[in-house]
């Protein structure tokens, strides 16, 4: 997250970190069910661990943390690397979470976002770009949903209805390491960090997010079919 600020503790209990060995964060994710996460499809890896209820990026033990293995990864069938359409994936955890103030799911919004909606994006991704500098703790950033026209103008021929753009002033954006993390609007999960320009936070080049309102049926059916 570029030019965000430290999230208040306990305010993002659905935020997950996807980790490679040894404790290497590569993506964010979102708890949407006691045993299921949503993340970006481009975050798919064979072997990874899931950390929930953790505030700092470092692997130091925190009392609220819960660690899991991903036992099943189900990318949306319409996703094709390295494209960006349909960029979402469900991850089944090896066990159900223990609900606490630090770990609990968020509902996915069935309403599509309208331009001007205020949202919050979070993650442990780099806070500089193109340099790489990681934060000590989870970062939060207020962003506004942009109209689909502004989105298409920013990225001609690259935007479809499985995506929406959101941003703020130039110099504020999600970035590398934030993929799969939540965009929360009006208390529900509206999007996932997906892609954007490089370097991040360039003027008139907003972040692009997976438009989850288009996938509520697939999410529900996939969880039911695999539970």
């Amino acid at each position: 997250i570029i030019n965000g600020s430290d999230c208040d503790m306990h305010t993002q209990p659905w935020q997950a970190a996807l980790l490679l060995r040894p404790n290497q964060l590569y993506c964010g994710a979102v708890l949407v069910h006691p045993q299921w996460l949503l993340t970006a499809a481009h975050c798919r890896k064979k072997v990874f661990r899931v950390r929930l209820g953790h505030y700092s990026l470092s692997p130091v033990y925190e009392s609220g943390q819960q660690m899991f293995q991903g036992v099943k990864s189900i990318p949306h069938p319409g996703y094709s690397h390295p494209g960006h359409s349909n960029d979402l994936m469900l991850i089944k955890l090896n066990r159900r979470i223990r609900p606490t103030k630090d770990v609990r799911p968020i509902n996915v919004s069935s309403h599509c976002p309208s331009a001007g909606t205020k949202c919050l994006v979070s993650g442990w991704g780099t806070t500089k770009s193109p340099q790489v500098h990681f934060p000590k703790v989870l970062q939060c950033l207020n962003i506004s949903v942009l109209s689909q026209k502004r989105c298409e103008d920013a990225y001609p021929r690259q935007i479809d209805d499985t995506m929406f753009c959101a941003g703020d002033k130039a110099g504020r954006d999600s970035c590398q390491g934030d993929s799969g993390g939540p965009v929360v609007c009006n208390g529900s999960l509206q999007g996932l960090v997906s892609w954007g320009d490089y370097p991040c936070a360039r003027p008139n080049r907003p972040g692009v997010y997976t438009n989850l309102c288009k996938f509520t049926k697939w999410i529900q059916e996939t969880i039911q079919a695999n539970s």
Partner: antibody, heavy 126, light 107 residues
Framework: EVQLVESGGGLVQPGGSLRLSCAAS????????MNWVRQAPGKGLEWVSY????????DYADSVKGRFTISRDNAKNSLYLQMNSLRAEDTAVYYC???????????????????WGQGTTVTVSS | DIQMTQSPSSVSASVGDRVTITCRAS??????LAWYQQKPGKAPKLLIY???SLQSGVPSRFSGSGSGTDFTLTISSLQPEDFATYYC?????????FGGGTKVEIK
């Protein structure tokens, strides 16, 4: 078949210019960042330049900064390297290489260069 | 710039031998290291990415390990087609830099 084919190399005098081209086929060129890498005779690999998929980010090795210009034409599936003020030490085989890392995607995961051309030889000599 | 130091610069080995090549970065690069194989007159070929992930189509006798500053490429049982020069490369930070190479020769 995924393929990169370089062209444009040759013999040039010190201070001269050359333009290298790299034609891509078998994949969606505008989804990938690209690189130029060179190898002087009997020496190791040296990264020369990088360009992101949308051309929004470009970088160069210090040894070529201000003299070389990387560009791409996604409509033509082509990558270019304009080389000016050439020096004897620029003599090398020049490879174009596809970068497997999508810098547009916002995961923190880096791969490397998975597809390389056969190389084109540049000789700078009087 | 990040310096990549490979050792040894050359190694003589026989078919069936286990060969280990090391690469050291001048500063931490997490797991973001790639290994390439290059045969004379040919372009390099990506073997391993993210320090330990095998590129599609690469034989399982090749393996990589390490993170931070110290990395290793191992060929568990050297085959005739493995005699080549091997390069490491750090990929997260511009300018990208390669190690000086390790030539694996027939003993």
């Amino acid at each position: 078949e995924v393929q990169l084919v370089e062209s444009g190399g040759g013999l040039v005098q010190p201070g001269g210019s050359l333009r290298l081209s790299c034609a891509a086929s078998g994949f969606t060129f505008n989804d990938y960042s690209m690189n130029w890498v060179r190898q002087a005779p009997g020496k190791g690999l040296e990264w020369v330049s990088y360009i992101s998929s949308s051309s929004s980010y470009i970088d160069y090795a210090d040894s070529v900064k201000g003299r070389f210009t990387i560009s791409r034409d996604n409509a033509k599936n082509s990558l270019y390297l304009q080389m000016n003020s050439l020096r004897a030490e620029d003599t090398a085989v020049y490879y174009c290489a596809r970068d497997l890392t999508s810098m547009q995607s916002r995961d923190y995961y880096y791969y490397g260069m998975d597809v390389w051309g056969q190389g084109t030889t540049v000789t700078v000599s009087s | 710039d990040i310096q990549m130091t490979q050792s040894p610069s050359s190694v003589s080995a026989s078919v069936g031998d286990r060969v280990t090549i090391t690469c050291r970065a001048s500063q931490g690069i997490s797991s973001w290291l790639a290994w390439y194989q290059q045969k004379p007159g040919k372009a390099p070929k990506l073997l391993i990415y993210a320090a330990s992930s095998l590129q599609s189509g690469v034989p399982s006798r090749f393996s990589g390990s390490g993170s931070g500053t110290d990395f290793t490429l191992t060929i568990s049982s050297l085959q005739p087609e493995d005699f080549a020069t091997y390069y490491c490369q750090q990929v997260p930070i511009f300018p990208y830099t390669f190690g000086g190479g390790t030539k694996v020769e027939i003993k």
